[in-house]
Amino acid sequence: TPEVWVQVQMEATELSSFTVHCGFLGPGSISLVTVSWGGPDGAGGTKLAVLHPELGTRQWAPARQARWETQSSISLALEDSGASSPFANTTFCCKFASFPEGSWESCGSLPPSSDPGLSAPPTPVPILRAD
């Protein structure tokens, strides 16, 4: 069964900077990745970035840079301009659309005890949906 993992990491050097890492474990080729926060895409979540493997990437504030790390994983850098960090308690969700499997989504957040530089373990709350 395909699986999506999500890691949320606070940057050690800049406490207001976070990175979301997502990956797809499974066969098939990825046709689109959507990253949202506050919940799954289309279910109360706000879209942060859309990444297409050939056509490029689109990101919206507070996303700073969306990148492909490998053919099946992406990273999204976030910049928190506020004094207090809303990202610390936020859920980030990644949805991978792949052929022929369909869409698979998973969410994760920064663990409450996270030290800067440490990432959440790759065991997110799974919201695995095959569309």
Epitope: K47, L55, G56, T57
Partner: antibody, heavy 118, light 107 residues
Framework: EVKLVESGGGLVQPGGSLKLSCVAS????????MSWVRQTPEKRLELVAD????????YYSDTVKGRFTISRDNAKNTLYLQMSSLKSEDTAMYYC???????????WGQGTLVTVSA | DIQMTQSSSSFSVSLGDRVTITCKAS??????LAWYQQKPGNAPRLLIS???SLETGVPSRFSGSGSGKNYTLSITSLQTEDVGTYYC?????????FGGGTNLEIK
Amino acid sequence: EVKLVESGGGLVQPGGSLKLSCVASGFTFNTYIMSWVRQTPEKRLELVADISNSGGNTYYSDTVKGRFTISRDNAKNTLYLQMSSLKSEDTAMYYCARPDNWDPFVYWGQGTLVTVSA
Amino acid sequence: DIQMTQSSSSFSVSLGDRVTITCKASEDIYARLAWYQQKPGNAPRLLISGATSLETGVPSRFSGSGSGKNYTLSITSLQTEDVGTYYCQQHWSTPWTFGGGTNLEIK
């Protein structure tokens, strides 16, 4: 035929405000991201702001963040750019432009000139 | 943001010349590059997208090439109507960014 018509430019003093409009026709407005691109007197092009088809997502360049607000009224097929705390470096020709999904700016308006000067 | 650099800001050329304009990105943009032509008093006009795809109505004397960080716009035989400023723009990663422009003028 796709048409984008900007209006609202003019001469304004530093610190002042201005609201630009762009009326779109010839396509289904509420299915496209829309953008404002400006061209400085030195002829440099800069993406100032863009907005998703529903208006739920926006982007602002660092040079205008916190001063400019992009919005849209899909019922009126109109894109807006509210500009406040204007600076002399905001002097430019402002174009309303439509990218084609993942493709670049296929359609541009004729532009509206904004001059910020005392 | 990805920086786009057009090394020549202007060229003085003769009619019939082959003209090559270059553009360099600060990182790989995977051939997601557009070229625009702008004539005085007009908005930019899209000529090429995806580094090589000519827009409808663009004369075949225009062509685009390149990959990775380096891209080229070529005009095989310069015509009077080709005079103007040419801009490159990456459309790989938002915010989309433009080069500084290369102005073509007749000698």
